[in-house]
């Protein structure tokens, strides 16, 4: 491991040894919520480190996290979801660092799924639809979605469209003819709850029709 900077700077920020970040997922398993935390510094020796959450809990004062490999995880119904909780990194009984966090401000939605694209020949467009488990939830129901698409050959030239519904229409004339496209979607809380983007959905691939030379229009596949 020669040449590896054990005490080098973190790329984005100067962080103390025990800086950590967390996200919550509400009603992720029936009525159970989850909270996941991890250290930001990949060099932290986590062998004897534990996480604990206290405050803004129902029926209990504190809860301990389970360590899953190199993350820390709780699944429970006991989050009050009103006010701030205190999340601490502990070694034995000693707290090394703590953060006061309102769990409703660090919500990471579940990834959208069932993404598909249907070509409408008469309308000369593509209808993009997808699903989200949040339509059935009590808490985090309102999301903003980010649909990203690109021509498969263009490594990093993504076009992004933000929308609040789960349906989007892409005009055929805005896309290249006879090209393979990749499309994916992610979600973020958009009303009352705050937080982070979900993971991306699995990608969906579709091909645009050829141009019909006589009319200048695309042929369906």
């Amino acid at each position: 491991e020669s040449g590896y900077a054990q005490n080098g700077d973190l790329e984005d920020a100067e962080l103390d040894d025990y800086s950590f970040s967390c996200y919550s997922q509400l009603e992720v398993n029936g009525s159970q919520h989850s909270l996941t935390c991890a250290f930001e510094d990949p060099d932290v020796n986590i062998t004897n480190l534990e996480f604990e959450i206290c405050g803004a809990l129902v029926e209990v004062k504190c809860l301990n996290f389970r360590k899953l490999q190199e993350i820390y995880f709780i699944e429970t119904k006991k989050f009050l979801l009103i006010g701030k909780s205190n999340i601490c990194v502990k070694v034995g009984e000693k707290s090394l660092t703590c953060k006061k966090i309102d769990l409703t401000t660090i919500v990471k939605p579940e990834a959208p799924f069932d993404l598909s694209v249907v070509y409408r020949e008469g309308a000369n467009d593509f209808v993009v639809t997808f699903n989200t488990s949040h339509l059935q939830k009590k808490y985090v129901k309102v999301l903003m979605h980010d649909v990203a698409y690109r021509q498969e050959k263009d490594e990093n030239k993504w076009t992004h469209v933000n929308l609040s519904s789960t349906k989007l229409t892409l005009l055929q004339r805005k896309l290249q003819p006879a090209a393979m496209y990749e499309i994916k979607v992610r979600s973020i809380p958009d009303h009352y709850f705050k937080g982070f983007w979900s993971e991306w959905s699995p990608s969906y691939y579709f091909r645009t029709p050829e141009i019909n030379n006589s009319s200048g229009e695309m042929d369906p596949i």
């Epitope: 973190l10 790329e11 970040s21 991890a38 930001e40 510094d41 990949p42 490999q69 190199e70 993350i71």
Partner: nanobody, 117 residues
Framework: QVQLVESGGGLVQPGGSLRLSCAAS????????MSWYRQAPGKEHELVAS????????RYADSVKGRFTISRDNARNQLYLQMNSLEFEDTAVYYC??????????WGQGTQVTVSS
């Protein structure tokens, strides 16, 4: 069974760029600190860059700092290494693996990066 498949290497001139990818399977990728390592002929594995489980913290070897960028996509179990301003000394076989290796962990086949004019 843990599987790590690296790709994206090649022959590049000094000052050029490459983007390495690693497809991981057989373990819970999103729960692990991940790293890129490299091995030059006749040398030990050298730790090049590491990234936290959420991707919000990174570390780099002094020799690559400011030139290489590690990133990850937990939805796709993918690890990446963007390599810019490549130098002759970057020539090596590049491997991805866990930062904290388990006793049973093997290495993938790696991807060869050759910097030559």
């Amino acid at each position: 069974q843990v599987q790590l498949v690296e790709s994206g290497g090649g022959l590049v001139q000094p000052g050029g760029s490459l983007r390495l990818s690693c497809a991981a399977s057989g373990f819970t990728f999103s729960q692990r600190i991940m790293s890129w390592y490299r091995q030059a002929p006749g040398k030990e594995h050298e730790l090049v860059a590491s990234i936290s489980p959420f991707g919000d913290g990174t570390r780099y070897a002094d020799s690559v700092k400011g030139r290489f960028t590690i990133s990850r996509d937990n939805a796709r179990n993918q690890l990446y290494l963007q390599m810019n301003s490549l130098e002759f000394e970057d020539t090596a076989v590049y491997y991805c693996n866990k930062r904290n290796l388990d006793v049973s962990d093997d290495w993938g086949q790696g991807t060869q990066v050759t910097v030559s004019s």
